[in-house]
């Protein structure tokens, strides 16, 4: 039994890091393998992650981590029984994929203005809380070409757009994702989408 593709890990910079790897053949990851991980710090304890299958030869493990901070570094040991298959390390702050924003809501009752709001996925004491910026994707269910991205580079989790920038009388969907420049993160997954019917009063013709 050998590792074909070494584990690569990403952290949500809060409580979970996800590691994925591939074996050289079909493997029952949960019964044959264990991923041991330990913070390189005084008094830290070793933890064991039981991997799940991710395709025939692929495995995935969700590592639970307490109090993730930028200085943290973890040792990783992949075991098959008594055999050490791979040894490595992982610094969560260097491989961050933020959590997806939640609670996306479209407020349509503000005088021909659409107000989109969502929730920051981090608590205020997490470093990423004040460092997320967002991308909002709005698209028409009727017209695949009517697809737009708004970059929200300020910290407030909201976006105002004029209803008239979208077509009236049709349904639109929106979703939002996040990233943080400070840690050069990847983009989060998209939030669940929300749907609304866009309608606004056309201005009177002179």
């Amino acid at each position: 039994m050998k590792v074909l593709q070494e584990p690569t890990c990403v952290s949500d910079y809060m409580s979970i890091s996800t590691c994925e790897w591939k074996m050289n053949g079909p493997t029952n990851c949960s019964t044959e393998l264990r991923l041991l991980y330990q913070l390189v710090f005084l008094l830290s304890e070793a933890h064991t992650c039981i991997p799940e299958n991710n395709g025939g030869a692929g495995c995935v493990c969700h590592l639970l981590m307490d109090d993730v901070v930028s200085a943290d570094n973890y040792t990783l040991d992949l075991w098959a029984g008594q055999q050490l298959l791979w040894k490595g390390s992982f610094k969560p702050s260097e491989h961050v994929k933020p959590r997806a924003p939640g609670n996306l809501t479209v407020h349509t009752n503000v005088s021909d203005t659409l107000l989109l709001t969502w929730s920051n996925p981090y608590p205020p004491d997490n470093y990423l809380y004040n460092h997320l910026t967002y991308a909002v994707n709005i698209w028409s269910e009727n017209d695949p070409a009517d697809f737009r991205i708004y970059n929200v580079t300020y910290l407030e989790p909201s976006l105002r757009i004029a209803a008239s920038t979208l077509k009236s009388g049709i349904s639109y969907r929106a979703r939002v994702r996040a990233w943080a420049q400070c840690y050069n993160t990847t983009w989060s997954e998209w939030s669940p989408s929300t749907k609304w019917h866009n309608s606004y009063r056309e201005p009177f013709e002179q």
């Epitope: 008094l43 830290s44 304890e45 307490d66 109090d67 901070v69 200085a71 943290d72 004491d125």
Partner: antibody, heavy 116, light 111 residues
Framework: QVQLVQSGAEVKKPGASVKVSCKAS????????MHWARQAPGQGLEWMGI????????SYAQKFQGRVTMTRDTSTSTVYMELSSLRSEDTAVYYC?????????WGKGTLVTVSS | QSVLTQPPSVSAAPGQKVTISCSGG????????VSWYQQLPGTAPKLLIY???KRPSGIPDRFSGSKSGTSATLAITGLQTGDEADYYC????????????FGTGTKLTVL
């Protein structure tokens, strides 16, 4: 919000022991290390040791080895620092502080006075 | 006797900039993460800077930290009377066993 509430001031005689408590709230108690530090009147900060509330393991500054004991009670989210064989130079404000590589939240401090 | 040395005192007028140095060695600053703490008169210390140069939420950007080799610096711009306090650097030291160490402390006076 994170709060560390320490026990009240103590007056002790030389040779006695003192046990200071620090009750944590507003976060997952076992997920964060806790430090103890002290500050003698008009002096700087001095680190005493650290406890991992998850397993209860501890590490103490060499100066306090054999005299200090740090414990925790996960049922009440409280850590304790006991210092024995007190002498007058142990008169200080004792602080608990949460953190690992740095100390991000501090208790208000407990004044321990050692006097005959 | 702390292994991290700071100037005992610094002073400057309101609106000015002041820097506080923290000098250590390869077993502490040179090999770990520096944090800075502010202690206003009669209160507990408060985290001001961590991981050498990061600010916790709520700390204004007038406060900044840097590290080079075995020394670290705290800079405060646009000095305010409310900044008058004691400032301590801190880091882990691994010379014998692992210990957290604080600097000797610096008293900032706003003239």
């Amino acid at each position: 919000q994170v709060q560390l509430v320490q026990s009240g001031a103590e007056v002790k005689k030389p040779g006695a022991s003192v046990k200071v408590s620090c009750k944590a709230s507003g976060y997952a108690f076992t997920s964060y290390y806790m430090h103890w530090a002290r500050q003698a009147p008009g002096q700087g900060l001095e680190w005493m040791g650290i406890i991992n509330p998850s397993g209860g393991s501890t590490s103490y500054a060499q100066k306090f080895q054999g005299r200090v004991t740090m414990t925790r009670d996960t049922s009440t989210s409280t850590v304790y620092m006991e210092l024995s064989s007190l002498r007058s130079e142990d008169t200080a404000v004792y602080y608990c502080a949460r953190g690992k590589w740095w100390l991000d939240y501090w208790g208000k401090g407990t004044l321990v006075t050692v006097s005959s | 006797q702390s292994v991290l040395t700071q100037p005992p005192s610094v002073s400057a007028a309101p609106g000015q900039k002041v820097t506080i140095s923290c000098s250590g060695g390869s077993s502490n600053i040179g090999n770990s993460y520096v944090s800075w703490y502010q202690q206003l008169p009669g209160t507990a210390p408060k985290l001001l800077i961590y991981d050498n140069n990061k600010r916790p939420s709520g700390i204004p950007d007038r406060f900044s930290g840097s590290k080079s080799g075995t020394s670290a610096t705290l800079a405060i711009t646009g000095l305010q009377t409310g900044d008058e306090a004691d400032y301590y650097c801190g880091t882990w030291d691994t010379s014998l066993s692992a210990n957290y160490v604080f600097g000797t402390g610096t008293k900032l006076t706003v003239l």
